[in-house]
């Protein structure tokens, strides 16, 4: 029972995590314009992995896709790759884990096969989570580096007379979604691996015992029976949770307004 619960919970947590990784990958707010200690601009810039957007105080938002592959920074390409690998591995892991679930019966699938599939999906979830965490962390590191570089020359003077507003970028919502989602996928993967141990069938070998009936010399040798650890025993109705996590990709047409100070 505990094994089923652990496996089911691992699946649901991973499902939510992977949905989060997909959401983070698609979100536009990986980096957002830093408003602290900056003139209050009537435009708000934010960038994602696939496009950059500008939200004007008029309420209009204009987004432009990165219509180039070669012209993009290598780090951005690496982050994209990590996130996509995470999603692909997570998706395969989900597919495998559906068939590995104890509460789902498929033909005459052996417990050992279910255990192997549970372990496989668990490892996939762990790698998927690590990919997402790594991708988000690489992007965050890139932001921190650029932030301090732009802070060093925040205002570039033109003979000390004209000031140029240097747009600095800080962590966007997608980074936090990515970290949390990656962590959930990782936890889900660990739970699946733990569940796998409980699912693994144990070989129960009974030693041959000789029974001597009076007057007869017949030896009965019972064959080695495999302990059927709960296969098909759980006939209760079980709910399979469809943990589809919906995340809203911040397309509000107006920035959170603060009075100009």
């Amino acid at each position: 029972m505990a094994v089923t619960a652990c496996q089911g919970l691992g699946f649901v947590v991973s499902l939510i995590g992977i949905a989060g990784i997909i959401a983070a990958t698609c979100m536009d707010q990986w980096s957002t314009q830093d408003l602290y200690n900056n003139p209050v601009t009537a435009v708000f810039n934010y960038q994602g992995l696939w496009r950059s957007c500008v939200r004007e105080s008029s309420g209009f938002t204009e987004c432009r896709g990165y219509f180039t592959l070669l012209g993009l920074p290598a780090m951005l390409q690496a982050v994209r790759a990590l996130m996509i690998v995470g999603i692909v591995l997570g998706a395969i892991g989900l597919l495998v884990s559906i068939f590995a679930l104890k509460c789902i019966r498929i033909g005459s699938m052996e417990d050992s096969a279910k255990a192997n599939m549970t372990l496989t999906s668990g490892i996939m979830f762990i790698v998927s989570g690590l990919c997402a965490i790594a991708g988000v962390s690489v992007f965050a590191n890139m932001l921190v580096t650029n932030f301090w570089m732009s802070t060093a020359n925040m205002y570039t003077g033109m003979g000390g007379m004209v000031q140029t507003v240097q747009t600095r970028y800080t962590f966007g919502a997608a980074l936090f979604v990515g970290w949390v989602a990656g962590g959930l996928t990782l936890i889900g993967g660990v739970m699946m691996c733990i569940a796998c141990r409980g699912l693994a069938p144990e070989e129960t070998n009974y030693k041959a015992v000789s029974y001597h009936a009076s007057g007869h010399s017949v030896a009965y040798k019972p064959g080695g029976f495999k302990a059927s650890t709960g296969f098909g025993s759980n006939t209760k109705n079980k709910k399979i949770y469809d943990g589809g996590a919906r995340t809203e990709d911040e397309v509000q047409s107006y920035p959170s307004k603060h009075d100009y100070v």
């Epitope: 314009q33 003139p39 209050v40 601009t41 009537a42 435009v43 810039n45 960038q47 950059s52 957007c53 500008v54 004007e56 105080s57 008029s58 309420g59 209009f60 204009e62 432009r64 004209v162 000031q163 140029t164 507003v165 747009t167 047409s253 107006y254 959170s256 307004k257 009075d259 100009y260």
Partner: antibody
């Protein structure tokens, strides 16, 4: 056709308050924000502030903070500006205007003249 | 606040001639996020509200004759009227659309010679 119809001219006493209305028609009111601009007689234009017609969020020019209050009534597609503690400095024509791309003001009301006199 | 300076304050013209007026801001109005300059130009006739001519420094508002051209980047901007018509005799204002509070220039008045 987009139209911003403002309330008529007002003659008010010093220290009093006045409420200017700006009724929008010809477009979905909540899809656009509303800006307010002051023009003193024979002078240039001054930006007062901006209000989000959907959420009611505001941004004010520091100079007009405490002087002007912007509100909206979505049901009647009307934006309002209340000017308080009026003095002779507030004698001007006040415009409501709809911001468009680039934060530029593409449609303007006809203006409301405020005269402060005892 | 950003200071927007317009020059000249008034300009005497004859119909048909080319007119150029300048607008300078104390800070750059260029947004690196979308590579656009947040400056607009308005025309105002006496007793009338201003009318939008140009936004994003060089994009002509629909319905505005193509004799009106906006140019410039960063802090220096120009409005050019290729061939002035009688109906163009009015006041012209530029506006900083980039940094709050949004500020207007003092204006350039176009008068008949």
């Amino acid at each position: 056709e987009v139209q911003l119809q403002q309330s008529g001219p007002e003659l008010v006493k010093p220290g009093a308050s006045v409420k200017i209305a700006c009724k929008a028609s010809g477009y979905t009111f909540t899809d656009y924000n509303m800006d307010w601009v002051k023009q003193s007689h024979g002078k240039s234009l001054e930006w007062i502030g901006n209000i989000n017609s959907y959420y009611g969020g505001t941004i004010y020019n520091q100079k007009f903070k405490g002087k002007a209050t912007l509100t909206v009534d979505k049901s009647s597609s009307t934006a309002y500006m209340v000017l308080r503690s009026l003095t002779s400095e507030d004698n001007a024509v006040y415009y409501c205007a709809r911001p468009h791309l680039g934060n530029a003001l593409d449609y303007w009301g006809q203006g409301t003249s405020i005269t402060v006199s005892s | 606040d950003i200071v927007v300076t317009q020059s000249p304050s008034s300009l005497t013209v004859t119909p048909g001639e080319k007119v150029t007026m300048s607008c300078k801001s104390s800070q750059s109005l260029f947004n690196s996020g979308n590579q656009k300059n947040y400056l607009s130009w308005y025309q105002q006739n006496p007793g009338q509200p201003p009318k939008l001519l140009i936004y994003w420094a060089s994009t002509r508002q629909s319905g505005v004759p193509d004799r009106f051209t906006g140019s410039g980047s960063g802090t220096d901007f120009t409005l050019t009227i290729s061939s002035v018509q009688a109906e163009d005799l009015a006041g012209y204002y530029c506006q900083n659309d980039y940094i709050f509070p949004l500020t207007f220039g003092a204006g350039t008045k176009l008068e008949l010679k």
